[in-house]
Interface confidence: medium
C-alpha cells in the first residue's frame, strides 16, 4: 500500500502536489509499511480494541487562518478514557483515587512501555532496531528520551505526509509559501506502540485556511459606554479602536504596518502606524467604518521581466510584488538598504487585510460629578447612623438609574450597592441620599447611567463620630475624568 | 547613480492649484515611498505626504489634508504632488525625497529632488 | 503627533572642536536620521537608523541616543561643515523634523 491509499480519500491534482511542495515533507506515493503499521477501515471491529479501557480520542487544532507565507502551527492532543493519563517517564497509567466503570484498579499501568522497550528490543548496539521505524521505513530520531515517546503521528496534506514521534501532545509547523490559497484538509493518523509493532488508535482530521490577507481584527473601547460588543457607542466622547492583527508565526514582525482608516464621517482618511487610534464623532447617526491594513512582507519573487511592451498591466489589488535591486545604490555601506528587508529575502510583497464596521452614535452620559455633599441630621433613635446628601450634576445625556457603591477606602471591598431609577429635568441636577453605618473613611462609586451609557465619579468621604462639632470632611477627592481633574466640593454641614 | 529631478519654478495666484512632478531614476522606482516635504524661505521642513508608488498607498499630513493629493506615474518613474486653494503661506520650496525601502521607518529620505520653488502672490 | 526639539537652534564653534548636537522627541522613538542642509541646496542625509553613517558621509559625523533622547556629534569640526542640521523621525505619522540647529564656523 501506499500512504494515500491509507491516509485519505482526497487526491489532490498532479498540479497541486507540484506546487503545494512542503518542506520536510515525503511525497504519499511512498510505501506504507503494513506489517508493522496494520490499517483499519472506519467501522472495523479492531478499533474497540485498539486501547486498553475505551476509546482515546484525538484534538486536532491549528492557528488557521494562516498568511501565505507564513507558519501555520497544527496542535494534537490525545484524550485517554477517564482515570487514564501519561506519566514522566512516558507510560499510561491509572489516576490514583479514581474510580472508572471498571473500579479501582489494582495493577498502576495501563500500558508500561518502559518495561516492553527493556524486554523485547532484540536491538543491536546502536540502539536501532527493524521495529523502531516509521511506516516509510525511516528510522526514529533517536534523541534524548525518544524512549519515552510511545505515539507515533501522521500528518497527510496536499498529498505529502510528516511523521512525528511524540507523547501524548505534538505540534508541527508548515510553511504556507507554497500552499494553495483557500481551505485545505489536514489528517492525521495516531498509532501506539504494541509490542514489535504498532496500533492505531486514533484518526483526526481538520481544515486550516492560508490566505493572501491579512487576517484583521478591531477592539473598539469607550468610557461610558454601556455594552462595547453591540457597536453603538456615544457623541462626543473618543471611542479606542484597537486593530489586532492575526499572526502566531510572528510573519510580519520586520514589517512596516501601515493602518488607513475611514471613519464614514467626512473627517477624511487617517493613516497609521500605530495599531491604536482615537476618533470621537460629533454627530449621531449610523457610519460605516473601514479599515485597510496594509504591510510589506517577505514573498516571491515575480519572473524577470520579458522585453519591454507598450502598455504595462495593472498589479493585482491583492498583492503587489516588489524586487530588490542588490545593485541598486544605496546611501551607506555596500548594501544599506538590506537594512529593512527580512534576512535571507529578496523580495518583498504588498499584503493587505479590510476590516468593516457599522457604528451607532447616540446621545449619551459623558460626565459625573459631585459638586455637594450634605450631612443631613439624624433623628436620636439611630445615633450610629449619618445621612448623607450627594448633589450630582451630569453632562450629555439624561440619566434614568442612579446608583451607589459604598466600599473600604480602597474601593475594593463592597459594603453596600443600592441602585434605583431616577427622574432629572433638564439640567441634570439631582440628590442622593445614602446612609453610613458608622464613622470612618468610606469609597463611594456613583454612577449615571441610562439605556446606552454608564458615568463614574468616585470620592473618598471621612464620616466622623455623631458629635455635632464635627463636620463631614472629604478624605480624598478622584475620579475617573481623563482630565485627571481634582473635583471641586463644596461642603455644608446643618 | 540614483537621481531625482524636479519641474521647474511656478509663480501663481491665491485659490489656484500646483503640480509639481518628481522624475526618477536609477533604482527600481516602484521599490521606495516617496516623500514630499516643503521648507519656507529661512524656515525649517515640514512633512507633506509620502506616497507607495507600488499600490499608491498615501499618507498625508492632516496640516496639508484636503489640499493635497499625490500621484504616480510608474510607466515613467515620475510621482507628482498637487497642491490646491493656494494660499500666501504655500509660497515655498517644495522637495521630493525618496523614502525607506517599502516605507521603513529604518531608513530616512536617502535621495532629494533639487526642489521647486513656488511662489503664491496675487 | 511627535514633536522633535533640537537644541541649540545655533551655535558657533571653531575648526577642530567638537560639536554636538541633541534632538529630543516627545514620545519614545525608534530610530532618528540627521540632515545637513546648506543653503539654496537639498538636505543631505548623513546618519540613517540613529547611528548608521549614510554612503559617502565623513566618519567625524556620528549619532547615538535612543527612546527620546538623541544626539548627533562632528568629532573634528571642518570649514565645510557650516549648515544647518535637523533631525527627522518617521516612526509615527506625521513624519516630523527638528527646528534645525545653525552652525557657524568662528
Known amino acids: 500500500k501506499r500512504f494515500h491509499d491509507v491516509l485519505g480519500n482526497e487526491r489532490p491534482s498532479a498540479y497541486m502536489r507540484e506546487h503545494n511542495q512542503l518542506n520536510g515533507w515525503s511525497s504519499d506515493e511512498n510505501d506504507w509499511n503494513e506489517k508493522l503499521y496494520p490499517v483499519w477501515k472506519r467501522g472495523d471491529m479492531r478499533w474497540k480494541n485498539s486501547w486498553k479501557g475505551g476509546r482515546v480520542q484525538a484534538v486536532l487544532t491549528s492557528d488557521s487562518p494562516a498568511l501565505v507565507g507564513s507558519n501555520i502551527t497544527f496542535a494534537v492532543n490525545l484524550i485517554f478514557p477517564r482515570c487514564q493519563k501519561e506519566d514522566a517517564n512516558g507510560n499510561i497509567v491509572y489516576e490514583k483515587n479514581c474510580r472508572n466503570e471498571a473500579g479501582l484498579s489494582a495493577d498502576p499501568y495501563v500500558y508500561n512501555w518502559t518495561a516492553w522497550s527493556e524486554d523485547s528490543d532484540g536491538e543491536n548496539g546502536t540502539g536501532q532496531s527493524h521495529h523502531n521505524v516509521f511506516p516509510d521505513g525511516k528510522p526514529f530520531p533517536h534523541h534524548p528520551g525518544w524512549r519515552r515517546w510511545n505515539f507515533i503521528y501522521v500528518f497527510h496534506t496536499l498529498g505529502q505526509y510528516f511523521q512525528k514521534l511524540g507523547r501524548c501532545s505534538v505540534r508541527v509547523s508548515v510553511n504556507t509559501a507554497n500552499v494553495t490559497l483557500g481551505p485545505q484538509l489536514m489528517e492525521v493518523t495516531v498509532y501506539r506502540r504494541h509490542g514489535r509493532a504498532y496500533v492505531p488508535i486514533a484518526q483526526v482530521k481538520d481544515v486550516y485556511v492560508v490566505t493572501d490577507q491579512i487576517p484583521v481584527f478591531v477592539t473598539m473601547f469607550q468610557k461610558n459606554d454601556r455594552n462595547s460588543s453591540d457597536e453603538t457607542f456615544l457623541k462626543d466622547l473618543p471611542i479606542m479602536f484597537d486593530v489586532l492583527i492575526h499572526d502566531p508565526s510572528h510573519f510580519l514582525n520586520y514589517s512596516t504596518i501601515n493602518y488607513k482608516w475611514s471613519f464614514g464621517d467626512n473627517t477624511g482618511l487617517f493613516v497609521s502606524t500605530n495599531h491604536t487610534v482615537n476618533h470621537t464623532y460629533v454627530l449621531n447617526g449610523t457610519f460605516s467604518l473601514n479599515l485597510t491594513v496594509k504591510a510589506a512582507a517577505p514573498g516571491p519573487c515575480p519572473p524577470p521581466p520579458p522585453p519591454p511592451r507598450p502598455s504595462k498591466p495593472t498589479p493585482s489589488l491583492a498583492t503587489t510584488l516588489k524586487s530588490y535591486d542588490s545593485n541598486t545604490p544605496g546611501p551607506a555601506g555596500d548594501n544599506p538598504l538590506e537594512l529593512s528587508r527580512i534576512p535571507d529575502e529578496n523580495c518583498q510583497i504588498n499584503r493587505y487585510g479590510h476590516f468593516q464596521a457599522t457604528i451607532t452614535i447616540v446621545e449619551g452620559i459623558l460626565e459625573v460629578n459631585i459638586i455637594q455633599m450634605t450631612d443631613v441630621l439624624m433623628p436620636v433613635p439611630w445615633p450610629e447612623s449619618s445621612l448623607i446628601d450627594f448633589v450630582v450634576t451630569c453632562q450629555g445625556s439624561i440619566p434614568t438609574e442612579v446608583c451607589t457603591i459604598i466600599s473600604d477606602p480602597t474601593c475594593e471591598i463592597t459594603q453596600n450597592t443600592v441602585c434605583s431609577p431616577v427622574d432629572v429635568d433638564e439640567m441634570c441636577l439631582l440628590t442622593v441620599r445614602r446612609t453610613f453605618n458608622g464613622s470612618g473613611t468610606y469609597c463611594v462609586n456613583l454612577t449615571l447611567g441610562d439605556d446606552t451609557s454608564l458615568a463614574l465619579t468616585s470620592t473618598l468621604i471621612s464620616v466622623p463620630d455623631r458629635d455635632p462639632a464635627s463636620p463631614l470632611r472629604m478624605a480624598n477627592e478622584f475620579d475617573y475624568k481623563d482630565d485627571d481633574d481634582k473635583l471641586e466640593h463644596h461642603h455644608h454641614h446643618h | 547613480q540614483v537621481q531625482l529631478v524636479q519641474s521647474g519654478a511656478e509663480v501663481k495666484k491665491p485659490g489656484a492649484s500646483v503640480k509639481v512632478s518628481c522624475k526618477a531614476s536609477?533604482?527600481?522606482?516602484?521599490?521606495?515611498?516617496m516623500g514630499w516635504v516643503k521648507q519656507r524661505p529661512g524656515q525649517g521642513l515640514e512633512w507633506i505626504g509620502a506616497i507607495d508608488p507600488s499600490d499608491s498607498f498615501t499618507n498625508y499630513n492632516q496640516n496639508f489634508a484636503g489640499r493635497v493629493t499625490m500621484t504616480v506615474d510608474t510607466s515613467i518613474s515620475t510621482a507628482y504632488m498637487e497642491l490646491s486653494r493656494l494660499r500666501s503661506d504655500d509660497s515655498a520650496v517644495y522637495f521630493c525625497?525618496?523614502?525607506?525601502?517599502?516605507?521603513?521607518?529604518?531608513?530616512?529620505?536617502?535621495?532629494w529632488g533639487q526642489g521647486t520653488l513656488v511662489t503664491v502672490s496675487s | 503627533e511627535i514633536v522633535l526639539t533640537q537644541s541649540p537652534s545655533s551655535l558657533s564653534a571653531s575648526v577642530g572642536d567638537r560639536v554636538t548636537i541633541t534632538c529630543s522627541a516627545s514620545?519614545?522613538?525608534?530610530?532618528m536620521h540627521w540632515y545637513q542642509q546648506k543653503s539654496g541646496t537639498a538636505p543631505k542625509l548623513l546618519i540613517y537608523?540613529?547611528?548608521n553613517l549614510a554612503s559617502g558621509v565623513p566618519s567625524r559625523f556620528s549619532g547615538s541616543g535612543s527612546g527620546t533622547d538623541f544626539t548627533f556629534t562632528i568629532s573634528s569640526l571642518q570649514p565645510e561643515d557650516a549648515a544647518t542640521y535637523y533631525c527627522?523621525?518617521?516612526?509615527?505619522?506625521?513624519?516630523?523634523f527638528g527646528g534645525g540647529t545653525k552652525l557657524e564656523i568662528k
Open positions: 527627522h523621525q518617521w516612526n509615527s505619522y506625521p513624519c516630523t
Open positions: 536609477g533604482y527600481t522606482f516602484t521599490d521606495n515611498w
Open positions: 514620545s519614545s522613538i525608534s530610530y
Open positions: 525625497t525618496r523614502s525607506g525601502y517599502y516605507g521603513s521607518p529604518k531608513l530616512g529620505g536617502d535621495y
Open positions: 537608523s540613529t547611528s
